[in-house]
């Protein structure tokens, strides 16, 4: 049986059950190669409390559909008195990066995971030439996820004192020059994740081969190497390589751009101070407030919730968008879709799509940007579920009693973008 998601095959992936202090290793095409789980384990569970390992999915006992992967075992378990076998179940959804498997829940018999990934899309529009896992769990099993930094088009310009060259990088995947052919990037070779531009020439100085690595609690490392054997004539016989060190800052701050810290013989060392390198609990909340123990800021958007069936309305030329954030009030137009953002076609109001659901909510404050994300909306033709990204700006003089109103700014591949100026986005630093 052929591997159902070949682009996920090259790596062993990790997922975590934080509540129970369990680390899962997942290899969907082979075995995880952990001796304690046996030679054919595809899903190996490491219980850090008891320091024990159990195979909860066997690579030989795999069954697959387009969106579901199941690994059975021969180990019996008891579920409501019936004799079942322990198994792992991975549900796949279309995403814009390789993504990460997320632990959902576990019963006595079944370990459930969900994975939003380009590998599950019906069309190849989000697929990279080369992409590597872009997240890590630290020793406390807290997730550090750089997926939000991955550019689907274009690249980051590295801050460098050399006026004659420009070094462009992407994070964890190659630079897509076709979707956004900026004049400088157009000459970059396909597959490169680090492109050096000198005049009208561009050179591949690194491609991703290994996934993201954790080297200290607050430091992540990503390495790119040039795959082709041919040496570049300005590298003094050395093979080019790029090392990017992502540093979680010691306190809240605005985002910075990646900086070149060392260069010799085409070996480039880059340091990027960004809060995306911090653990996810520091950056995100599933509610509309960020003020827990983990975060050192105080943000509360719950006053933006609309009651009594009314919604915010944002005009998007062909469409009207109805928004009801930070609550579970049904939008009237979007009957029973549990939508936080509802897209209605002006010319045919019966054409209604959920552009993100209220129970699929993430509030994120990172590198000075406050963003509310609603995902899991109705599917587009690519298989990607519509989502909405609302970027908030602090405005102490916002209208509508300080609440302000959302403004639609555009759509890219079924992701809808809004900006929202409101006094409730004014971030308060927490007192020490």
């Amino acid at each position: 049986q052929a591997a159902p998601f070949p682009e996920l095959c090259s790596y062993t992936w990790e997922a975590v059950d934080t509540k129970n202090n369990v680390l899962y290793k997942i290899n969907i095409c082979g075995s995880v190669d952990i001796v304690q789980c046996g030679p054919s384990s595809a899903v190996c569970m490491h219980d850090l409390k008891t320091r024990t390992y159990h195979s909860v999915g066997d690579s030989v006992l795999r069954s697959a559909t387009r969106s579901l992967l199941e690994f059975n075992t021969t180990v019996s378990c008891d579920q409501q008195g019936t004799n079942h076998r322990v198994q792992s179940s991975i549900a796949f959804l279309c995403g814009k990066t390789l993504g990460t498997p997320e632990f959902v829940t576990a019963t006595e018999c079944v370990h459930y995971f969900e994975w939003r990934t380009t590998a599950a899309c019906k069309k190849d529009i989000f697929k990279a030439n080369k992409e590597v896992p872009c997240y890590v769990f630290d020793e406390e099993l807290r997730k550090h996820d750089l997926n939000p930094l991955i550019k689907l088009s274009g690249a980051y310009l590295v801050d460098d004192s050399d006026p004659d060259t420009s070094l462009f990088i992407n994070v964890c995947r190659d630079i897509d020059t076709l979707r956004d052919p900026g004049s400088q990037l157009r000459a970059c070779p396909p597959g490169t994740a680090a492109c050096l531009v000198r005049g009208h020439q561009a050179f591949d100085v690194g491609q991703p081969r290994d996934g993201l690595k954790l080297v200290r609690k607050d430091r992540l490392v990503l390495s790119y190497v040039r795959e082709e054997a041919g040496k570049l004539d300005f590298c003094d016989g050395h093979s080019p390589a790029v090392t990017i060190t992502f540093v979680c800052p010691s306190e809240r701050r605005e985002g910075t751009i990646p900086k070149l810290t060392a260069k010799s013989n085409c070996r480039y060392e880059i340091e990027w101070i960004t809060e995306y390198a911090c653990h996810r609990d520091y950056l995100e909340s599933k509610t509309c407030s960020l003020s827990g123990e983990q975060q050192d800021v105080s943000i509360d958007l719950t006053p933006l919730a609309q009651s009594g069936g009314s919604s915010y309305i944002s005009d998007g030329k062909e469409y009207l968008f109805y928004l009801n954030v930070c609550g579970e009030t049904e939008i009237q137009f979007c009957n029973k879709k549990q939508a936080a953002v509802c897209q209605v076609k002006k010319s045919d109001t019966s054409q209604v799509k959920a552009a993100g659901r209220y129970h699929n909510q993430t509030l994120r404050y990172s590198d000075g940007d406050l963003t509310l994300i609603y995902f899991g909306g109705d599917e587009c033709s690519s298989g990607f579920q519509r989502m909405s990204v609302i970027n908030f700006e602090c405005n102490k003089t916002a209208g509508n009693d300080g609440k302000g109103t959302p403004v639609f700014t555009g759509e890219v591949d079924c992701t809808y973008f809004f900006t929202w100026d409101t006094e409730y986005a004014c971030v308060k630093e927490k007192e020490d």
């Epitope: 990790e14 290899n27 190669d33 952990i34 081969r209 290994d210 690595k213 954790l214 080297v215 490392v221």
Partner: nanobody
Framework: QVQLQESGGGLVQAGGSLRLSCAAS????????MGWFRQAPGAEREFVAY????????YYADSVKGRVTISRDNAKNTVYLQINSLKPEDTAVYYC?????????????????WGQGTQVTVSS
């Protein structure tokens, strides 16, 4: 299973060099990430160097950066640690370790296979 056997340790003067070797047998060596750790008497085992299976990622502890190089020869199933400008504080038992798909590269628990160690003593 993977078996690891270190060699190349010994007594050396401060400022000298050593090349430690770690020979692997068993499973396909080229699939494994490799690390070197060391343990001085009465101290915890500490990370020294890491090399990914692909050779694409190397990483060194700050205490040895610039003096140490990790490399591998997949044809010989061997990983090496070249240590230059040795200091008395480099005295320790040096361990070679292997693991599959290592993410936390300085964490001992992520390496599932360990050698017995080779003693390095640096005299002043």
């Amino acid at each position: 299973q993977v078996q690891l056997q270190e060699s190349g340790g010994g007594l050396v003067q401060a400022g000298g060099s050593l090349r430690l070797s770690c020979a692997a047998s068993g499973r396909t060596f080229s699939n494994y990430d490799m690390g070197w750790f060391r343990q001085a008497p009465g101290a915890e085992r500490e990370f020294v160097a890491y090399l990914s299976w692909s050779g694409g990622t190397t990483y060194y502890a700050d205490s040895v950066k610039g003096r140490v190089t990790i490399s591998r020869d997949n044809a010989k199933n061997t990983v090496y640690l070249q240590i230059n400008s040795l200091k008395p504080e480099d005295t320790a038992v040096y361990y070679c370790a292997a693991g599959s798909a290592i993410v936390r590269i300085t964490t001992t628990r992520d390496y599932h296979y360990w050698g017995q160690g080779t003693q390095v003593t640096v005299s002043s």
